[in-house]
Amino acid sequence: MRTEAQVPALQPPEPGLEGAMGHRTLVLPWVLLTLCVTAGTPEVWVQVRMEATELSSFTIRCGFLGSGSISLVTVSWGGPNGAGGTTLAVLHPERGIRQWAPARQARWETQSSISLILEGSGASSPCANTTFCCKFASFPEGSWEACGSLPPSSDPGLSAPPTPAPILRADLAGILGVSGVLLFGCVYLLHLLRRHKHRPAPRLQPSRTSPQAPRARAWAPSQASQAALHVPYATINTSCRPATLDTAHPHGGPSWWASLPTHAAHRPQGPAAWASTPIPARGSFVSVENGLYAQAGERPPHTGPGLTLFPDPRGPRAMEGPLGVR
């Protein structure tokens, strides 16, 4: 999505703010930041690798290269999510992670990338010939999906050595463009600073009318919630076929959060509120999120051994005490 930043009009500096270098200096960094963040088209990446240590284990890693905040990630196999693919895991930045066998461990790697370990039964299993897809619902970009599969020669001995995730990869043109804008901005800021140095600063009048502007907080799960999202263990299905429908979910819509794999000590944010909300197979990510939040506090219809139930209707966060975010 190529979006152009709306650059606010630079107003003449107010007399009372001249000592603080006026609006111009304060506005410019934000304008530059907006230009940098909104430049370029989002890209989604998927990497599928067979673990050299365990021949039956696959690692799927996905990431979103865009400016928006991720609101939901869906990992599926057998094709794209809305077209015959079977959901393996759903990751929400705040509400936690849900996964189905044969997914073994889904987790956030960064705010915009995830990884999923999949348990198979060797290279000859159906997994070795399967397409894995990741769909990122992000605001404001919308939904973006990419798919990947194992290379034809999936012998771990022959495969390329593991390389760092392409999270920080960007096109040279993009880097140069952003660098140029930033360099120009820095030079301009230095010019303003120098000009300000040579100008005698008038006395600052304390402003009675303008309260201190609240500091904007960027979207990002905290370190604690990031750690809480990591699911340590899940049901392992040694065959690479999807589990039967009574334990997993039909193609159209999974039996949501019915047997949430969770670790009581490790996952304070495990969502009981997510227990049995049906998700539309298609539709915008807004409707998906609305569906997830619709039945907050409802008890799941059947619970597996791994499910931690939170009796408080407000969900798990109500039990967190002083550390919980209300």
Partner: nanobody, 127 residues
Framework: QVQLVESGGGLVQAGGSLRLSCVAS????????MAWFRQAPGKEREFVAY???????????SYADFVKGRFTAFRDNTRNTMYLQMNRLRPEDTAVYYC?????????????????WGQGTQVTVSS
């Protein structure tokens, strides 16, 4: 040169789905980026989606604004076929869809960046 053959087009009702295929033959190993373009009658050819890949088996995908999560471009693990899964089709998606391949690496949105083209497959979405 890479030879590309598209298939999977046809007539579909609005809201329906289609999956287009593009089979590559020839010097397929030299193609690093494959894309879908479309051309509606009386309009210019426009970028729909691309998929590109790297040596560490990482697949990337990017899409045009109008796709808005409805289409998914991907390839199978034999690396010889690329697909365009089209969901929630609209009448304005009616066009001839072309598969294209570029032999150099990059994030390409312009038709001029691609040096191999298929003959196209017609997609008609009726309201």
């Amino acid at each position: 040169q890479v030879q590309l053959v598209e298939s999977g087009g046809g007539l579909v009702q609005a809201g329906g789905s289609l999956r287009l295929s593009c089979v590559a033959s020839g010097r397929t190993f030299s193609a690093n980026t494959m894309a879908w373009f479309r051309q509606a009658p009386g309009k210019e050819r426009e970028f729909v989606a691309y998929t590109r890949w790297t040596d560490d088996n990482t697949d990337y995908a990017s899409y045009a604004d109008f796709v808005k999560g409805r289409f998914t471009a991907f390839r199978d693990n034999t690396r010889n076929t690329m697909y365009l899964q089209m969901n929630r089709l609209r009448p304005e998606d009616t066009a001839v869809y072309y598969c294209a391949a570029a032999t150099t690496r990059g994030t390409y949105y312009s038709a001029g960046d691609y040096n191999s083209w298929g003959q196209g497959t017609q997609v008609t979405v009726s309201s």
